[in-house]
């Protein structure tokens, strides 16, 4: 819309029809140009010319929010909109006030005003922006986490939607979307949005709000899915009768009025448009739902969103098709149903879809329901390669176990490349903290072997000046290092193989590790503060550093390394999409740094680095340093936590998965 003044005065135009529609999560450019006959104006020979002042604002009934102001080549952005709005062509083209808006959210809908002031002249133009689309969570009818990547897309397509992009999920999150269920996205990553972190929903962000990610996953792994419904031209409406309808009757009822049962996606779009019905109705996928736009206690527990009626208290299963509800119909020719056989399925392979509502509703569950599942934990979707019940872990650690894990189960049997009989108990379990929030993060307790006059050390009183002792294992497997390889491994991590004295001092400072490792003198030892069955070693139930004595150099164990002070600084690096291993290397290099080594991270930890985010290190491991323990950050002890691929604490993360990074310079 243009507001021109008389001919030779300042005029501003937005050459774009209003409303301008754009998709959630995308960026948008609003062109704005001005013609300024006065330019440049000089007030007196001695003063500089006045330059026009550009102001962009968003106008609503309640208020006007200034997005940015530009004058004399300088652009000042409202801090709330920093990194969100910009003038891409200014000041290169002084009369071009085109506005760019990144990562569109639903909340960005509204009327945008481009205003130019020059001296006492003032002109403006406005444009309405409508951000289209809604992201919603989908789940197969039977149970949670059953959709591979293909089926996930099919689920969305059958519900008038497409699989959402990471940008769309991020935008929905910023609009308030919260869901503790891991779901596929279009880029083959698996993520979930969390505003109020809680046990079972921490993922890779611990107690910080944000969209959790597992990175790129294998297409055969199974999760839920996040779908994106763009828009609809038709109308969703309720059909009802005093005795209500069975599913089949509901479908027939819609047909008799020239419509069909609405899809879940269409209902979400209707809800987004303000639909509010306190009565549940059948949808095309045989689910039963109702849209609540005005919260009230007796309608969906005082929560907004599309509410779902489930068969079971753990939010799975649809009502019996013979039960009676209203019919939710859709009239419109803008959607064409894709035939079932276009997904190559039939009969028993058929899936229909259901969602958990937005915002998240946690039902009180009967005691026999898996508690972790109620909270949104991931049930590992492993083919049962172990004769045991599946391990429950939180969404952030969900992994479909690969057959390569072998048949050894979590407490390892101390497998070795060279079989040697030991007269003592061999450390057989992966070190696990009692309350590890992360299923596959190791609870390595690492103790600073440092002391300064009057300093209180936690825990205990170490006797060595400077440095840190830490346990090291290559990502692939436990007990794989010969004596030679062990020394090299420590050097590669920016450390040196520890001496028995250093390990002893660490033990006295409270260090415990139930993993046998090489030391400088070719002995193999491990420090145990609280003896337990697989860790008694040569000391039975007494605490102490267990030893196997001098071992043949060809035998394979882990290693204990020692790192002295840090020559440089370790810093935490991140970006919104995070990094693959290669991207992390490149990012550090761009900062005149390298990915930090494990040793450097331990040294930085000993100097107080505390980060509740796992980050890539130079050896392809994922670790994070915790100085102040808190429940959400790797348990109740300080130390450097390691994220492993498998629950038995072996395996490196996929180099293509996305994480933060620790750089060193």
């Amino acid at each position: 819309e243009e507001v021109p003044d008389h001919d030779n005065s300042l005029s501003v135009s937005i050459p774009q029809p209003s409303p301008l529609k754009a998709l959630l999560g995308t960026s948008l450019t609003i062109p704005c140009y001005f013609i300024d006959p006065m330019h440049p104006v000089t007030t007196a020979p001695s003063t500089a010319p006045l330059t026009p002042r550009i102001k962009w604002s968003r106008v609503s009934k309640e208020k006007e929010v200034v997005l940015l102001v530009a004058t004399e080549g300088q652009v000042r952005v409202n801090s709330i909109y920093q990194d969100k709005v910009s003038l891409p062509n200014y000041p290169a083209i002084p009369s071009d006030a085109t506005l760019e808006i990144q990562n569109l959210r639903s909340n960005d809908s509204g009327i945008y005003r481009c205003e130019v002031m020059h001296g006492i002249e003032d002109s403006e133009a406005t444009l309405e922006v409508i951000v289209k689309g809604i992201v919603f969570h989908y789940r197969a009818i039977s149970t949670r986490y059953t959709l591979d990547f293909d089926r996930a897309q099919r689920a969305c397509l059958q519900n008038s939607a497409i699989i959402a992009t990471p940008e769309q999920l991020q935008a929905a999150y910023e609009d308030g979307f919260h869901q503790c269920d891991a779901g596929w996205l279009a880029d083959q990553t698996v993520r979930y949005p969390i505003h109020t972190p809680r046990e079972g929903c921490y993922g890779d962000k611990d107690e910080f709000p944000g969209v959790r990610t597992y990175g790129i996953r294998d297409t055969n792994e199974t999760y839920d899915v996040y779908c994106f419904a763009e828009e609809m031209e038709g109308e969703v409406f309720y059909a009802t009768s005093p005795e209500k309808f069975t599913f089949q009757e509901a479908a027939n009822e819609c047909r008799t009025v020239g419509a069909r049962l609405a899809t879940t996606g269409q209902l979400y779009l209707a809800w987004q448009g303000g639909m509010d019905m306190c009565s549940a109705g059948w949808l095309a996928d045989r689910s039963v739902r109702y849209p609540i736009s005005k919260a009230r206690p007796n309608c969906g527990g005082n929560l907004l969103g599309v509410r779902t009626v489930y068969l079971h208290a753990n939010q799975t299963g649809y009502p019996d098709p013979s039960s009676r509800y209203d019919a939710i119909c859709y009239t419109g020719e803008d959607f064409v149903d894709i035939p079932e056989n276009f997904f190559g399925v039939g009969g028993e392979e058929d899936i229909t879809i259901q969602t958990v509502t937005w915002p998240d509703l946690e039902l009180p569950l009967p005691r026999n329901i898996t508690e972790g599942e109620a909270r949104g934990n991931v049930i590992l979707t492993a083919k049962p390669i172990f004769d045991m019940s599946p391990t429950v872990s939180e969404p952030g650690e969900a992994l479909t176990l690969a057959p390569e894990v072998g048949t050894t189960v979590f407490p390892e049997a101390g497998e070795r490349t060279e079989k040697t009989t030991r007269p003592w108990g061999f450390p057989e379990e992966a070190t696990r903290g009692p309350d590890s929030a992360t299923a596959f993060a190791s609870e390595d307790l690492v103790v600073r072997v440092t002391i300064s006059p009057g300093a209180v050390e936690v825990p205990g009183q170490p006797r060595l000046p400077g440095g840190v002792v830490f346990h090291y294992r290559p990502g692939s497997t436990r007990y794989s290092l010969t004596f030679e390889e062990a020394q090299q491994a420590c050097i590669r991590t920016g450390a040196a193989i520890a001496s028995p004295e250093q390990l002893q001092a660490a033990y006295e400072a409270g260090y415990e590790q139930c993993d046998a490792g090489w030391l400088q003198d070719q002995t193999v030892r491990y420090p145990i503060v609280s003896p337990r069955t697989p860790c008694v070693g040569d000391k039975d139930s007494s605490p102490g550093v267990r030893t196997y004595g001098v071992r043949p150099s060809s035998e394979t164990y882990d290693v204990y390394c020692y790192v002295d002070k840090l020559e440089g600084e370790v810093f935490f690096a991140t970006q919104m999409e995070q990094f693959t291993f290669q991207e992390a290397q490149a990012f550090c290099a761009a900062q005149n740094a390298t990915l930090a080594s494990t040793g450097q991270l331990y040294a930085a930890w000993s100097q107080g680095l505390d980060k509740c985010y796992a980050g890539w290190l130079a050896d392809g491991t994922l670790r994070y340093p915790i100085v102040n323990p808190r429940p959400a950050c790797g348990g109740d002890k300080p130390g450097v936590r390691t994220v492993y691929l498998y629950p038995n604490q072996t395996g490196l993360p996929d180099p293509l998965s996305k994480h933060h990074a620790f750089c060193f310079r």
Epitope: F149, D150, Q153, R154, L157, S160, A161, I162, I163, T165, A186, D187, Q188, T219, E230, E231, M232, E233, E333, D334, F335, V336, D337, I338, F343, G344
Partner: nanobody, 115 residues
């Protein structure tokens, strides 16, 4: 902005062949199921073929099985439909689609099979 642009249509004799292309932009093509849909004059839309995101699975309407082949080149963000042994009943406007929403499809390319 999401765009799907079809090309390759034309007039062909019965028994002849055509290869339709659809150039995609503005979305993650490599992560999307893709479809060919057609609409004959005065008729409803008819789904012709589908292909999954990796290209490993393809499905066809019974009327075109054995004659049509759907494929994709994710490096070029392009979807194809190879049509052999064309019949007069294949005459239609052919659309490339990534969802059931008609408004998100391309403009279509006309295929006419006539002697």
């Amino acid at each position: 902005e999401v765009q799907l642009v079809e090309s390759g249509g034309g007039l062909v004799q019965p028994g002849g062949s055509l290869r339709l292309s659809c150039s995609a932009s503005g979305f993650t093509f490599s992560g999307s199921w893709m479809f060919w849909v057609r609409q004959a004059p005065g008729k409803d839309y008819e789904w012709v073929a589908s292909i999954n995101s990796s290209g490993g699975r393809t499905y066809y309407d019974d009327s075109v099985k054995g004659r049509f082949t759907i494929s994709r080149d994710s490096a070029k963000n392009t979807l194809y439909l190879e049509m052999n042994n064309l019949k007069p009943e294949d005459t239609a406007l052919y659309f490339c689609a990534r969802s059931p929403r008609v408004g998100s499809w391309g403009q279509g390319t006309q295929v006419t099979v006539s002697s």
